[in-house]
Interface confidence: low
């Protein structure tokens, strides 16, 4: 069966939206009105992985682009990147682990934990216009909580 996917946008707990910044980078900033057209639409695919009531493995691709968020080691540090893939082969049910995030729902907020690097989360800075990154702390200054808005396909 084909992998189940939905289209959505994400905003962090400060209501910052995610937009492209260059070809392989996302940043978070406050958008309103017409500017919201700049935000990234994700294709969230439900993939194979450890699943529980509040933890669902997903892959986060960019809608209509052959780019997926992935987690890799750079300079010995878990790092978030946008990675190009062959659109003929993706998305797929059994995604490589670097593409997989555990979508965790807590108090109507979502966290995205790297399956490759447990306890590392998709994060944004408090500051405006800063890159989206993989952070190793929750509940600190950096933001790891998101809300999801469904987008009709």
């Amino acid at each position: 069966a084909p992998v189940r996917s939905l289209h959505c946008t994400l905003r962090d707990a400060q209501l910052k939206s995610l937009v492209m910044s260059g070809p392989y980078e996302l940043k978070a900033l406050h958008l309103q009105g017409q500017d919201l057209e700049q935000q990234v639409v994700f294709s969230m695919s439900f993939v194979q992985g450890e699943e529980s009531n509040d933890k669902i493995p997903v892959a986060l691709g960019l809608k209509a682009k052959n780019l997926y968020l992935s987690c890799v080691l750079k300079d010995d540090k878990p790092t978030l990147q946008l990675e190009s893939v062959d659109p003929k082969n993706y998305p797929k049910k059994k995604m490589e682990k670097r593409f997989v995030f555990n979508k965790i729902e807590i108090n109507n907020k979502l966290e995205f934990e790297s399956a490759q690097f447990p306890n590392w989360y998709i994060s944004t800075s408090q500051a405006e216009n800063m890159p989206v990154f993989l952070g190793g702390t929750r509940g600190g200054q950096d933001i790891t909580d998101f809300t999801m808005q469904f987008v009709s396909s």
């Epitope: 910044s21 260059g22 900033l29 017409q34 500017d35």
Partner: antibody, heavy 121, light 112 residues
């Protein structure tokens, strides 16, 4: 060809007001953030204000905050700077500048020729 | 505000010779997450508007001759011109884009 043409500069007394305009052509104006940058006579460059594509994110330098208002009309391909409570130190050439959004914020890739504002009694 | 300091302020150069301009920032412009330095260089030729030469400290803007190169990281940056030509005369500005933009005071390059 990208073109940015400023107008509206002139001589004004301290405490007075001016409205600068910038007519943009040669690119899809509504897809780019825009700036005003100024240059006092014989001095260096000073960033003044930034406005995002749909006017919903605006930033100002501390030196003009509360006195200047940046705005845009995408239907008219135009950028504006309303300057109130003008001071002697606002005397400068004011440049309309395009922001290269895809590179990184505040990377200014095209500049107009500038319009001169002189504040003097 | 991040303060940008350029040296020298005046730079007389013989055509064909190299030239180097230094720019120091009051805080690091290196974003450890993107591993990019948010620094740009501009040239303002006499009587003209500024033009973008370099961004991200070392990436040349399209159309900029390859005799221009940018280097450095953190707080110390350099713009080099491998062989100065008469058309390179003008004022060179560094500018940080890590925060709301601030420019250096400018370096005036003139031909000896």
């Amino acid at each position: 060809e990208v073109q940015l043409v400023e107008s509206g500069g002139g001589l004004v007394q301290p405490g007075g007001s001016l409205r600068l305009s910038c007519a943009a052509s040669g690119f899809t104006f509504s897809s780019f953030g825009m700036h005003w940058v100024r240059q006092a006579p014989g001095k260096g460059l000073e960033w003044v204000a930034y406005i995002s594509i749909g006017s919903y994110t605006v930033h100002y330098a501390d030196s003009v905050k509360g006195r200047f208002t940046i705005s845009r009309d995408n239907a008219k391909n135009s950028l504006y700077l309303q300057m109130n409570s003008l001071r002697d130190e606002d005397t400068a050439v004011y440049y309309c500048v395009r922001d290269d959004y895809d590179v990184t914020d505040y990377t200014m890739d095209y500049w107009g020729q500038g319009t001169t504002v002189t504040v003097s009694s | 505000d991040i303060v940008m300091t350029q040296t020298p302020l005046s730079l007389p150069v013989t055509p064909g010779e190299p030239a180097s301009i230094s720019c120091k920032s009051s805080q690091s412009l290196l974003n450890s997450r993107t591993r990019k330095n948010y620094l740009a260089w501009y040239l303002q030729k006499p009587g003209q508007s500024p033009q973008l030469l370099i961004y991200w400290a070392s990436t040349r803007e399209s159309g900029v001759p390859d005799r221009f190169s940018g280097s450095g990281s953190g707080t110390d940056f350099t713009l080099k011109i491998s062989r100065v030509e008469a058309e390179d005369v003008g004022v060179y500005y560094c500018k940080q884009t890590y925060n709301f933009p601030t420019f250096g005071q400018g370096t005036k390059l003139e031909i000896k």
